[in-house]
Interface confidence: low
Amino acid sequence: IVLRPSRVHNSEENTMRALTLKDILNGTFSYKTFFPNWISGQEYLHQSADNNIVLYNIETGQSYTILSNRTMKSVNASNYGLSPDRQFVYLESDYSKLWRYSYTATYYIYDLSNGEFVRGNELPRPIQYLCWSPVGSKLAYVYQNNIYLKQRPGDPPFQITFNGRENKIFNGIPDWVYEEEMLATKYALWWSPNGKFLAYAEFNDTDIPVIAYSYYGDEQYPRTINIPYPKAGAKNPVVRIFIIDTTYPAYVGPQEVPVPAMIASSDYYFSWLTWVTDERVCLQWLKRVQNVSVLSICDFREDWQTWDCPKTQEHIEESRTGWAGGFFVSTPVFSYDAISYYKIFSDKDGYKHIHYIKDTVENAIQITSGKWEAINIFRVTQDSLFYSSNEFEEYPGRRNIYRISIGSYPPSKKCVTCHLRKERCQYYTASFSDYAKYYALVCYGPGIPISTLHDGRTDQEIKILEENKELENALKNIQLPKEEIKKLEVDEITLWYKMILPPQFDRSKKYPLLIQVYGGPCSQSVRSVFAVNWISYLASKEGMVIALVDGRGTAFQGDKLLYAVYRKLGVYEVEDQITAVRKFIEMGFIDEKRIAIWGWSYGGYVSSLALASGTGLFKCGIAVAPVSSWEYYASVYTERFMGLPTKDDNLEHYKNSTVMARAEYFRNVDYLLIHGTADDNVHFQNSAQIAKALVNAQVDFQAMWYSDQNHGLSGLSTNHLYTHMTHFLKQCFSLSD
């Protein structure tokens, strides 16, 4: 049982109240984290509560404001970035969201030494991406899909690319599918460590089919949004990588980095770029059939002014059991010799672990091992490697930070976080200063989150950065639900689940059950994290039991579970939710006539299929922005797990796994279907097709659309959405309003 913040004595129990839906919608019980913006080994910046930008020196204990809130306010800045030479700050305003990571903004450069904004040769607007060089104060930015370079903020810009064109050619920024499904960033350019070179990607979307949808707005006629969006099996973007010498950009111009021959022989993706030194770069490539990844280390040839990627420096990662990597192919962390590196990939037992690659992948030295997974390599120094894993006490939904001494032999391993605040903190991430001199630990739960600062040599805690005292006080009179994280063993499969129980839970009584599902490949829902959210309210106030189950296809428990869904999406994820429900019924406290399931996105797909499974287990359910057919979703994501929708590949399962194919089976359940009409990710088309199939089958259902809302259903739509879903569930479970 996961412990929550301490309860008051029973005598005071009558002063405690349940959570309300309003609490959730107002974000009353949201928590804060503290991530230092490191600028050296011992200094970091932080935006204070009153919006001053403050520099902290850990060793001297001093702090001073480098940029006042007055300056920030003068341009309505919502973000900032200090140049590495500390002479300038860019200020970001007029933030305008595009897709998940991308946004445009207006940028102003403030000269700290002169205390004024840099004028003349100002930046165009809106800018799609802007960043400082890692050394000095060069600026690279993307405007109207082209890349520009400034040697100094006040200098005129040098235009690096000229072929950028909206929805056609993207330079230095990803197109939709690369942003969402491959890079997970708003940028596609990378400075070399000392700023000598700038690498960038060019994406050619000329031949990609376009998704078009109406944006209703306030005008007489709706706008049409057009996005080059490759659905499964469609033509993909063509990617090229270039590198330009930023010292003499006009000298030879951008030089293309060659693609490995084994990759270039068929459709492929670029997956990431990692600079090793100023004259060595590492590129990762992936075949369109995403079970072969090639890591290519390339060197600058001074004599030819070109980049050479010898075959001897190509490292191949191939999966025989699924796709390459986890959600993404992992990226390398290079060691100080600038050729060997550390990387997470599957070991022979099918668990993702850290390996040290010196010459070939085949000769990789395994650094971690066991029936658990290494999840992230945070930092490699001369003598230590810091990483996170879910090893401790065999709970896959935990994250602890470990240090391996790589300077000594044999290497010794130490868990930095396992025993710090054992009950409160079981799920950590970390942020390291230069050379890992200091680091911040951010604990996400299961107790109230806390952020702390530590010495990188001794691991000693220096100070608490954020402990959420106000939140702790606010929760003192709240009857929070109880949470359990346990596992079911079914047919050699371990199903971890989180159960959220009403505050006065009594095992001898019967409760309605709501399954919350995501279930997408390489996801994890059962995590030891703190949350006060909608399902907390449903348990606290409405007396429901809520369960989250990680079935086949979910992450961090080995390849057998992860790759079980390969080429068969929509089968085992659903089976495992159903299996878990049956086990929950056997526990004796579930009212089997009042069971519901709900999910969003992939979870909407799974919940729909579960409702249409014909088991009779579910009385009702909700699908928010569901995928309804894998033929409608993005190529990069879908094909990773499903292969191609062609007859000689996997078309049959693409057809068999649609929600529409099961329309008849919705007849005996209450179904609420919800979607935003401006969903750029899971297109409204998905729900439109479900609705059409249900109408054609003459099956009654409920639906709600959110006009001009995307996949996140944010703002006022959020309030409406959760209110609407609450009413639906209360009606389904015969709970009085």
Epitope: V289, V292, R320, G322, K348, Y566
Partner: antibody, heavy 122, light 107 residues
Framework: EVQLLESGGGLVQPGGSLRLSCAAS????????MSWVRQAPGKCLEWVSF????????YYADSVKGRFTISRDNSKNTLYLQMNSLRAEDTAVYYC???????????????WGQGTTVTVSS | DIQMTQSPSSLSASVGDRVTITCRAS??????LNWYQQKPGKAPKLLIY???TLQSGVPSRFSGSGSGTDFTLTISSLQPEDFATYYC?????????FGCGTKVEIK
């Protein structure tokens, strides 16, 4: 008809070299991984080496590592096994075999040649 | 390396008999197991891959089962053409080790 035809076997002295070839026909050679498997007289099967369809991913059994080299020429639809520093224990029938389609999950050898005999003896 | 142990090493059976051959891996190989049939002087033939998937063209009297370390090949009704040596092979990690075979002889 799918066919694999090995050649290049024969009698060789210990320490000598041989190059085996396997000519493939009836399928798209460049889209399949290929293996060499051997069987000493009256003994079990022993997997020797594997090469991926593009020729860049290669595995060897420990017993031959450093002495044998697998390669392929997709333009000639031919698989090779260069065998150096041969030993008496390398005496066997050598089969070339085709891997299951690369779109599948499993490794397995679905088509085999008739084998070529290598005898290492002084 | 993973070791593969087959049992029995030989067996005698009559036409129409149900025959079961077992194969044990020294560590879990999940379902990464293949079964081959070899007749004297001939190349092996793939019967089953992935522990239980019948290779196309193989008669349905052959079936495979098992997962982890223990696997079984079953011939539901032995036919005259089934007298041969049967090999298991792990396909989980290189070197893809074979078992040493089970010879099925006429009783």
């Amino acid at each position: 008809e799918v066919q694999l035809l090995e050649s290049g076997g024969g009698l060789v002295q210990p320490g000598g070299s041989l190059r085996l070839s396997c000519a493939a026909s009836g399928f798209t050679f460049s889209s399949r991984g290929m293996s060499w498997v051997r069987q000493a007289p009256g003994k079990c099967l022993e997997w020797v080496s594997f090469i991926s369809s593009s020729g860049t991913y290669v595995y060897y059994a420990d017993s031959v590592k450093g002495r044998f080299t697998i390669s392929r020429d997709n333009s000639k639809n031919t698989l090779y096994l260069q065998m150096n520093s041969l030993r008496a224990e390398d005496t066997a029938v050598y089969y070339c075999a085709r891997d299951l389609p690369r779109t599948g999950v499993y490794f397995g050898m679905d088509v085999w040649g008739q084998g070529t005999t290598v005898t290492v003896s002084s | 390396d993973i070791q593969m142990t087959q049992s029995p090493s030989s067996l005698s059976a009559s036409v129409g008999d149900r025959v079961t051959i077992t194969c044990r891996a020294s560590q879990s190989i999940f379902n990464y197991l293949n079964w081959y049939q070899q007749k004297p002087g001939k190349a092996p033939k793939l019967l089953i891959y992935g522990a239980s998937t019948l290779q196309s063209g193989v008669p349905s009297r052959f079936s495979g089962s098992g997962s982890g370390t223990d696997f079984t090949l079953t011939i539901s009704s032995l036919q005259p053409e089934d007298f041969a040596t049967y090999y298991c092979q792990e396909s989980y990690s290189t070197p893809y080790t074979f078992g040493c075979g089970t010879k099925v002889e006429i009783k």
